[in-house]
Interface confidence: medium
Amino acid sequence: VPRWRQQWSGPGTTKRFPETVLARCVKYTEIHPEMRHVDCQSVWDAFKGAFISKHPCNITEEDYQPLMKLGTQTVPCNKILLWSRIKDLAHQFTQVQRDMFTLEDTLLGYLADDLTWCGEFNTSKINYQSCPDWRKDCSNNPVSVFWKTVSRRFAEAACDVVHVMLNGSRSKIFDKNSTFGSVEVHNLQPEKVQTLEAWVIHGGREDSRDLCQDPTIKELESIISKRNIQFSCKNIYRPDKFLQCVKNPEDSSCTSEI
């Protein structure tokens, strides 16, 4: 009797997922000498152990604890950049501003960035056909639980002034349902974090509105203030110029507002 594989609504595991994770791990540890001690084979074994043979709708943060332990990394707690719905620009920024870090600049974030994975209950197979979709199937799936776990830990580690890059082109500039809105905001530690500074990135060249007055930003300010953390907000009207000025701060055109 053929055993019918569970059909999920989301895309299946990324092609050559094990190789990609292992290759990324080695590359990361080579580029970051402070992580040279990490045994990438053990990292892969721990990653695999978090979801293989488990029902892909029944994954817990505990499943990822062995991986979290192996990937423990100290980043400067006052140099953390969070982002929501504007990943590419955030990554371009930290590529230039090398002393600041997004989650994807850490080992665990780098390993999983843009990848999808899931297994099947009671078999050692990786499911390359389909994986659960967060909305249509279940929220406790391997990918969602992974990002919830690493995002929580990343936010908990932050201190002093924490920056967040937000997409001003979206209808909800601050979205309570995003990873930032549902996980990171609530795990910033008031005893360590003094200020959350939002950078609202404008999309249109002619957009001169003050998006810091947007209702969703006011909602974010309210949530943050209730947590005894100060809030500030800046409009980034010209993201291209912003990046250019990060690269060349002495440029004369960089004194004006960006």
Partner: antibody, heavy 121, light 107 residues
Framework: QVQLVQSGAEVKKPGSSVKVSCKAS????????ISWVRQAPGQGLEWMGG????????VYAQKFQGRVTITADESTSTAYMELSSLRSEDTAVYYC??????????????WGQGTLVTVSS | EIVMTQSPATLSVSPGERATLSCRAS??????LAWYQQKPGQAPRLLIY???TRATGIPARFSGSGSGTEFTLTISSLQSEDFAVYYC?????????FGQGTKVEIK
């Protein structure tokens, strides 16, 4: 048996570019890092950069950043190194070399035969 | 970047004698060090990796030692085919860097 076969010698004018290829056979091309190492006449070895074909994200030595482009084509198991804005000091034998372990960039256990690039006006 | 310094630049040895080559790193490279042999007109050949592990097919007369910043390659009894240039290379920190080489010549 792993073999790395490089393209033939090139003579180039200053300011131009050169693209050297390195075709691999045997082993899994995608998983082993390929590096490029050059050796000027009578001089030592100099690492230029490397790539894990599966990832397609090269890493370059600072000295060559902006002038060198390393790529890999998994479908043909071929790695490429392009060096632009050539000057006479770039006259050298250029080697491709494969990492000793899967996924790791070094040390190098397999080497191409070398490609002599001469830059002269 | 890590600077690798080899000494001596040239070593004159008689066949059958022992040769000792040194390599110093400007900062610790742990045991992530390799030794290569290169003969004129040929590509380098990996001899030792991990500071002390012989690569496949390398004769037992070649041995490596050291860790951190000081490394040694020893050829216990030089054969005629061992006269060549030897390079050390660190692969602990990007960019990988090589020493300037030690030429082992016939005395």
């Amino acid at each position: 048996q792993v073999q790395l076969v490089q393209s033939g010698a090139e003579v180039k004018k200053p300011g131009s570019s050169v693209k050297v290829s390195c075709k691999a056979s045997g082993g899994d091309f995608s998983l082993y890092a390929i590096s490029w190492v050059r050796q000027a006449p009578g001089q030592g070895l100099e690492w230029m950069g490397g790539i894990i074909p599966l990832l397609g994200e090269p890493v370059y030595a600072q000295k060559f950043q902006g002038r060198v482009t390393i790529t890999a084509d998994e479908s043909t198991s071929t790695a490429y190194m392009e060096l632009s804005s050539l000057r006479s000091e770039d006259t050298a034998v250029y080697y491709c070399a494969r990492g000793h372990r899967v996924y790791s960039s070094s040390p190098f256990d397999y080497w191409g035969q070398g490609t002599l690039v001469t830059v002269s006006s | 970047e890590i600077v690798m310094t080899q000494s001596p630049a040239t070593l004159s040895v008689s066949p059958g004698e022992r040769a000792t080559l040194s390599c110093r790193a400007s900062q610790s490279v742990s045991s992530n060090l390799a030794w290569y042999q290169q003969k004129p007109g040929q590509a380098p050949r990996l001899l030792i990796y991990g500071a002390s592990t012989r690569a496949t097919g390398i004769p037992a007369r070649f041995s490596g030692s050291g860790s951190g910043t000081e490394f040694t390659l020893t050829i216990s009894s030089l054969q005629s085919e061992d006269f060549a240039v030897y390079y050390c290379q660190q692969y602990n920190n990007w960019p990988w860097t090589f020493g300037q080489g030690t030429k082992v010549e016939i005395k």
